[in-house]
C-alpha cells in the first residue's frame, strides 16, 4: 500500500531573469527513492537516478541546474516559465508518487512591490 | 548532422592500459552526457559508464570501476576512455555514445574502436 | 544488477512478414526501456526508448510496448533492411544492461 505523501514549495513566485529552487520531499513512507523526474507539462526538464546521477535535458542545460539534493534550480527565468512543474518519484516497493508546483514568473517591478506566495 | 568519430584500432599487451578517443562534431558538446559501451567478439554489448563533459562529472559500472577513467576535453569536443591492467578478456570494439534528449539510452555511436590484447 | 532476457533468441522470418521480440526484465522499470538494431561490423541504431517512442527517422513499422518487467518490439511487415541483431536495454539505473540480444535473419 502507497502510504507516502509528497510535500512540494506549492505556489510560488520569482523574478524574471532571477533564479528559482524547485523542492519536492517524499514523507511518511520507508520506501527507498530510485528515480525523481522533473518535468514541466508534458517536458522533461532533468531526472536524478539514485545510481546514475543526473540528466538533464539539453534543451535546458545551459539554465538548469541539479538540486539542492533531490530539487532542481532554475536559472536566467523568463515569463513562458510560468506554469505548472511536477516532481516524479518512482521508488520501491511503493511505486511512483507525484508532486505539483505551480510557478509564476513576474516582471521585476511586479515581483518587487506585488504579493508573493510564501512558504511556511 | 551529429558525428562521433572514434580513434583507430589498437594492439596491447596484458598489463596495459589503452586510450580510446570519441571526436564530436554537429551538437554542443557540453549538453549531451556521452557514454562507453563495449562489445566482445560474437557477444552482446556491456555498458562501462558515462560523463558529463559540462562538469567532468562520470558515473561507472562497478565491474570496471576500478579500471576505468573517462574524462573529456572540452576544448577539442573530445571524450576519452582509458581501460587499464587490460587482460585477453577486454579484446572487444568499444563506442562512445551521446545520452539521448529524455534520459540513459544513447541516441548516436561512433563507428567503434577494436582493442586487441594479445602477448 | 538488472538482468535482462530476450526470446527469441533467434528466428527466421520472409519479408513482410510480421515479427514480434520480447525482452524481459528482472525488475521493475517503468518505462525506461530502449530498443537498438545491430548490423554485421556496424554500431548500434537508436529504434526506440521510453518503452514505446520512435527515435527520429525510425520508420514507424517499428513499435514498441510494455512497461513493467514485460517489453515487445514488434516490426509490422519486415523489410530486407531489418535482417539484424536486436538489443533491449533499459535505462533506469546502474549498471545500465543490455539484453542478449535477437538475431533476426532470412528464412
Known amino acids: 500500500m502507497m502510504t507516502g505523501t509528497i510535500e512540494t514549495t506549492g505556489n510560488i513566485s520569482a523574478e524574471k531573469g532571477g533564479s528559482i529552487i524547485l523542492q519536492c520531499h517524499l514523507s511518511s513512507t520507508t520506501a527507498q527513492v530510485t528515480q525523481v523526474n522533473w518535468e514541466q507539462q508534458d517536458q522533461l526538464l532533468a531526472i536524478c537516478n539514485a545510481d546514475l546521477g543526473w540528466h538533464i535535458s539539453p534543451s535546458f542545460k545551459d539554465r538548469v541546474a541539479p538540486g539542492p539534493g533531490l530539487g532542481l534550480t532554475l536559472q536566467s527565468l523568463t515569463v513562458n516559465d510560468t506554469g505548472e512543474y511536477f516532481c516524479i518519484y518512482h521508488t520501491y516497493p511503493d511505486g511512483t508518487y507525484t508532486g505539483r508546483i505551480f510557478l509564476e514568473v513576474l516582471e521585476s517591478s511586479v515581483a518587487e512591490h506585488g504579493a508573493r506566495f510564501q512558504i511556511p | 548532422e551529429v558525428q562521433l568519430v572514434q580513434s583507430g584500432a589498437e594492439v596491447k599487451k596484458p598489463g596495459a592500459s589503452v586510450k580510446v578517443s570519441c571526436k564530436a562534431s554537429?551538437?554542443?558538446?557540453?549538453?549531451?552526457?556521452m557514454h562507453w559501451v563495449r562489445q566482445a567478439p560474437g557477444q552482446g554489448l556491456e555498458w562501462m559508464g558515462r560523463?558529463?563533459?559540462?562538469?567532468?562529472?562520470?558515473k561507472y559500472n562497478e565491474k570496471f570501476k576500478s579500471r576505468v577513467t573517462i574524462t573529456v576535453d572540452k576544448l577539442s569536443s573530445t571524450a576519452y576512455m582509458e581501460l587499464s591492467s587490460l587482460r585477453s578478456e577486454d579484446t572487444a570494439v568499444y563506442y562512445c555514445?551521446?545520452?539521448?534528449?529524455?534520459?540513459?539510452?544513447?541516441?548516436?555511436w561512433g563507428q567503434g574502436t577494436t582493442v586487441t590484447v594479445s602477448s | 544488477d538488472i538482468q535482462m532476457t530476450q526470446s527469441p533468441s533467434s528466428l527466421s522470418a520472409s519479408v513482410g512478414d510480421r515479427v514480434t521480440i520480447t525482452c524481459r526484465v528482472s525488475?521493475?522499470?517503468?518505462?525506461?526501456l530502449a530498443w537498438y538494431q545491430q548490423k554485421p561490423g556496424k554500431s548500434p541504431k537508436l529504434l526506440v526508448y521510453?518503452?514505446?517512442t520512435l527515435a527520429e527517422g525510425v520508420p514507424s513499422r517499428f513499435s514498441g510496448s510494455g512497461s513493467g518487467t514485460d517489453f515487445t518490439l514488434t516490426i509490422s511487415s519486415l523489410q530486407p533492411e531489418d535482417f539484424a541483431t536486436y538489443y533491449c536495454?533499459?535505462?533506469?539505473?546502474?549498471?545500465?544492461?543490455f539484453g542478449p540480444g535477437t538475431k533476426v535473419d532470412i528464412k
Open positions: 555514445a551521446r545520452e539521448g534528449h529524455y534520459g540513459f539510452y544513447s541516441d548516436y
Open positions: 554537429g551538437y554542443t558538446f557540453t549538453n549531451y552526457y
Open positions: 525488475e521493475n522499470i517503468y518505462s525506461y
Open positions: 521510453n518503452a514505446k
Open positions: 560523463i558529463d563533459p559540462d562538469s567532468g562529472g562520470s
Open positions: 536495454q533499459h535505462h533506469y539505473g546502474n549498471p545500465l544492461t
